[in-house]
Interface confidence: low
């Protein structure tokens, strides 16, 4: 299945963190979502084989990339209290 690290993260405001996602074997697409209490589930970004394919409601302080080995990273910088949320990665062919 899809593997995300870290499972839990506690950090301070203003910090930068990196979330990593390894897609399911055979999958070339990676999707990132944010689920917060006040905003619900929001699509952030979609990569296909290293190429950005679609951008959703992703803040300028957030960036993502997908590497040639297909794993993806979501970078969250200048963190604010409102960034506290569940971050989901999904993959597909």
């Amino acid at each position: 299945g899809v593997t995300q690290t870290p499972k839990h993260l506690i950090t301070a405001t203003g910090q930068r963190v990196t979330l990593r996602c390894s897609p399911r074997s055979g999958d070339l697409s990676v999707y990132w979502y944010q689920q917060s209490l006040d905003q619900g589930l929001q699509f952030l970004i979609h990569y296909y084989n290293g190429e950005e394919r679609a951008k959703g409601n992703i803040l300028e302080r957030f960036s993502a990339q997908q590497f040639p080995d297909l794993h993806s990273e979501l970078n969250l910088s200048s963190l604010e209290l409102g960034d506290s949320a569940l971050y989901f990665c999904a993959s597909s062919v």
Epitope: T3, S22, G26, N49, F67, P68
Partner: antibody, heavy 122, light 107 residues
Framework: QVQLVQSGPELKKPGESVKVSCKAS????????VHWVRQAPGKGLEWMGW????????TYADDFEGRFVFSLDTSASTANLQICSLKNEDTATYYC???????????????WGQGTLVTVSS | DIQMTQSPYSLSASVGDRVTITCKAS??????LAWFQQKPGKPNKLLIY???TLQSGVPSRFSGSGSGTDFTLTISSLEPEDFATYYC?????????FGQGTKLEIK
């Protein structure tokens, strides 16, 4: 420059196992998938699957589930193919190949090893 | 899986000749076709991807064209080092599949 250098030819008996290695150089090994491709004598190329060099996770094509195992020695920038319980029909040249750069659609290969001939005969 | 059919199976030509190899997909693969050159004991060489994009370092006498199901590889003027076997490969969808190869021999 990018190079994939494979181990030498192997002669095995049915039922035995064989391990083919593929040593990468000239690039960051964990940045690119390594694929395996089979070519039986006088036949075309068959994609066997890949190994994710970052996570170590293998992906096998349908026809290569079971007796075929992809593994890594990341410290030596080496990918390995092991075939167990060899059959006569496993006689083939086995190639490793590097996934091409990200941003290109689908699965493709920009650098290949020179091939390793595995002969299975009693 | 998508079936890839190459023709001809083999081809005899002379240095300086213009040769064309064709590849047909069992369903549309858009423009996503690659061509490789194979020589015994040597690593396979990527020539073209995306149907017509020349891989870096590949001589301009090689060109590719086509989209959908029908594709061609053209060598405009054969050099001695071009005598080899050529394979097409679709990279439109999983799993990747190859043509059966075209052996280009010296006449």
């Amino acid at each position: 420059q990018v190079q994939l250098v494979q181990s030498g030819p192997e002669l095995k008996k049915p039922g035995e196992s064989v391990k083919v290695s593929c040593k990468a150089s000239g690039y960051t090994f964990t940045d690119y998938l390594v694929h395996w491709v089979r070519q039986a004598p006088g036949k075309g190329l068959e994609w066997m699957g890949w190994i994710n060099t970052y996570t170590g996770t293998p992906t096998y094509a349908d026809d290569f589930e079971g007796r075929f195992v992809f593994s890594l020695d990341t410290s030596a920038s080496t990918a390995n193919l092991q075939i167990c319980s060899l059959k006569n029909e496993d006689t083939a040249t086995y190639y490793c190949a590097r996934s091409w750069r990200r941003g290109l659609r689908g699965i493709g290969f920009d650098y290949w090893g020179q091939g390793t001939l595995v002969t299975v005969s009693s | 899986d998508i079936q890839m059919t190459q023709s001809p199976y083999s081809l005899s030509a002379s240095v300086g000749d213009r040769v064309t190899i064709t590849c047909k997909a069992s369903k549309s693969i858009n423009k996503y076709l690659a061509w490789f050159q194979q020589k015994p004991g040597k690593p396979n060489k990527l020539l073209i991807y995306d149907g017509s994009t020349l891989q870096s370092g590949v001589p301009s006498r090689f060109s590719g064209s086509g989209s959908g199901t029908d594709f061609t590889l053209t060598i405009s003027s054969l050099e001695p080092e071009d005598f080899a076997t050529y394979y097409c490969q679709q990279h439109n969808e999983y799993p990747p599949t190859f043509g059966q190869g075209t052996k280009l021999e010296i006449k």
